[in-house]
């Protein structure tokens, strides 16, 4: 039951995280005009990964897309790439994890396959979360650098004649959404990896042992590990030494290397 809960919770947390990463990537408020210690303007500037916007006091908002690709700063391109990679990995991870969920039955898929899929999706979520955190952090670092550069030079001369107020930008809401979302995706991924350990058998399954009452011969029957309907069916390493015949399912266990008949 604990494994199911961990896997389910990991999936939900990752789902929320990836939704947050997508939201952050699409948001326009990656950087917003710094209003502290600035001349009070009747326009408010903010920028995203894909476009920059200006909200006027009149209530009108005008957004312009970055239609150039080559003219954009390399750092912005890198952030875009990191966020997209994060989204793609996260989306694939979600798809994989849906089939890996123990509560969903797909044909006769074995638990070992589900365990592998859970681990795969977990790793994908971890990488996705790291990509988002890295992307947001790179952008934040870029902002901090530019902020102090513009603070040192609040008023820049345009052609030595015109005094233009340098617009300083600070952290926008998207950065915080991205950090939180990346963190959630990372946590979800870790939870999936933990759940994988509970799903997978500790060792390769040996053949089930079957005793027959009629004689003293020992029969080794093929059987292997069968997928059970319950989550973590808590089968202990118990031996049955009575002479009665047992079905494979009854004696199904995880034998250790030293379990000899």
């Amino acid at each position: 039951m604990a494994v199911t809960a961990c896997q389910g919770l990991g999936f939900v947390v990752s789902l929320i995280g990836i939704a947050g990463i997508i939201a952050a990537t699409c948001m326009d408020q990656w950087s917003t005009q710094d209003l502290y210690n600035n001349p009070v303007t009747a326009v408010f500037n903010y920028q995203g990964l894909w476009r920059s916007c200006v909200r006027e006091s009149s209530g009108f908002t005008e957004c312009r897309g970055y239609f150039t690709l080559l003219g954009l700063p390399a750092m912005l391109q890198a952030v875009r790439a990191l966020m997209i990679v994060g989204i793609v990995l996260g989306a694939i991870g979600l798809l994989v994890s849906i089939f890996a969920l123990k509560c969903i039955r797909i044909g006769s898929m074995e638990d070992s396959a589900k365990a592998n899929m859970t681990l795969t999706s977990g790793i994908m979520f971890i990488v996705s979360g790291l990509c988002a955190i890295a992307g947001v952090s790179v952008f934040a670092n870029m902002l901090v650098t530019n902020f102090w550069m513009s603070t040192a030079n609040m008023y820049t001369g345009m052609g030595g004649m015109v005094q233009t107020v340098q617009t300083r930008y600070t952290f926008g809401a998207a950065l915080f959404v991205g950090w939180v979302a990346g963190g959630l995706t990372l946590i979800g991924g870790v939870m999936m990896c933990i759940a994988c350990r509970g799903l997978a058998p500790e060792e390769t399954n040996y053949k089930a042992v079957s005793y027959h009452a009629s004689g003293h011969s020992v029969a080794y029957k093929p059987g292997g590990f069968k997928a059970s309907t319950g989550f973590g069916s808590n089968t202990k390493n118990k031996k049955i030494y009575d002479g009665g015949a047992r079905t494979e399912d009854e004696v199904q266990s995880y034998p250790s290397k030293h379990d000899y008949v």
Epitope: P39, V43, N45, Q47, S58, G59, F60, T167
Partner: antibody, heavy 118, light 113 residues
Framework: QVQLQQSGAELVKPGTSVKLSCKAS????????LNWVRQRPKQGLEWIGW????????NYNEKFQGQATLTTDKSSSTAYMQLSRLTSEDSAVYFC???????????WGQGTLVTVSA | DIVMTQSPSSLTVTAGEKVTMSCKSS????????????LTWYQQKPGRPPKLLIY???TRESGVPDRFTGSGSGTDFTLTISSVQAEDLAVYYC?????????FGAGTKLEIK
């Protein structure tokens, strides 16, 4: 069509208050901000402040802070400006005007003449 | 506060003539976010409220004759009337729409001979 209808002329005594109204019609009242502008006799224009009827958000020119109070009544699509502690210097025509692109003012009321005299 | 200086304070022209009037601001009205200049031009005829002519320094309001042209950037702006008509007799004001408080120039009075 868009119209801003302002209240009639006022003759008031120094030290008293006056409340001017500006009734909007022909557009969604809560969507656009309304500005108030003063024009003293034979003088230029002075911006007093603006109010957004939608959320009641206001912004005042510091010069008029404390003296002018902007309010709206959404049910009647009317904006109000209360002027307190009036002096002869406040004798002017007061306009209400609607915000537009570039923070410009594209529709204006006809103006209300306020005369402050003992 | 941002000071808007208009010149000349008045000018007299004959109908059909080209007129230019200037407006200078004490600080740049150019917004780096959208590269627009937040300057507006109004026309006020005697006994009437002001009428919007130009916003964003050069965008003509709909219904305004194309003889009115706004130009300039940063701190220096110009309103040009290519061929003055008798009905253009008015006071022309420029307004800073970028910094609070939003300030107006003292106006340029246009008179027709």
């Amino acid at each position: 069509q868009v119209q801003l209808q302002q209240s009639g002329a006022e003759l008031v005594k120094p030290g008293t208050s006056v409340k001017l109204s500006c009734k909007a019609s022909g557009y969604s009242f809560t969507t656009y901000g309304l500005n108030w502008v003063r024009q003293r006799p034979k003088q230029g224009l002075e911006w007093i402040g603006w109010i957004f009827p939608g959320d009641g958000n206001v912004n005042y020119n510091e010069k008029f802070q404390g003296q002018a109070t902007l309010t709206t009544d959404k049910s009647s699509s009317t904006a109000y400006m209360q002027l307190s502690r009036l002096t002869s210097e406040d004798s002017a025509v007061y306009f209400c005007a609607r915000f537009y692109y570039g923070n410009s003012l594209n529709y204006w009321g006809q103006g209300t003449l306020v005369t402050v005299s003992a | 506060d941002i000071v808007m200086t208009q010149s000349p304070s008045s000018l007299t022209v004959t109908a059909g003539e080209k007129v230019t009037m200037s407006c200078k601001s004490s600080q740049s009205l150019l917004n780096s976010g959208n590269l627009r200049n937040y300057l507006t031009w109004y026309q006020q005829k005697p006994g009437r409220p002001p009428k919007l002519l130009i916003y964003w320094a050069s965008t003509r309001e709909s219904g305004v004759p194309d003889r009115f042209t706004g130009s300039g950037s940063g701190t220096d702006f110009t309103l040009t009337i290519s061929s003055v008509q008798a009905e253009d007799l008015a006071v022309y004001y420029c307004q800073n729409n970028y910094f609070y408080p939003l300030t107006f120039g003292a106006g340029t009075k246009l008179e027709i001979k």
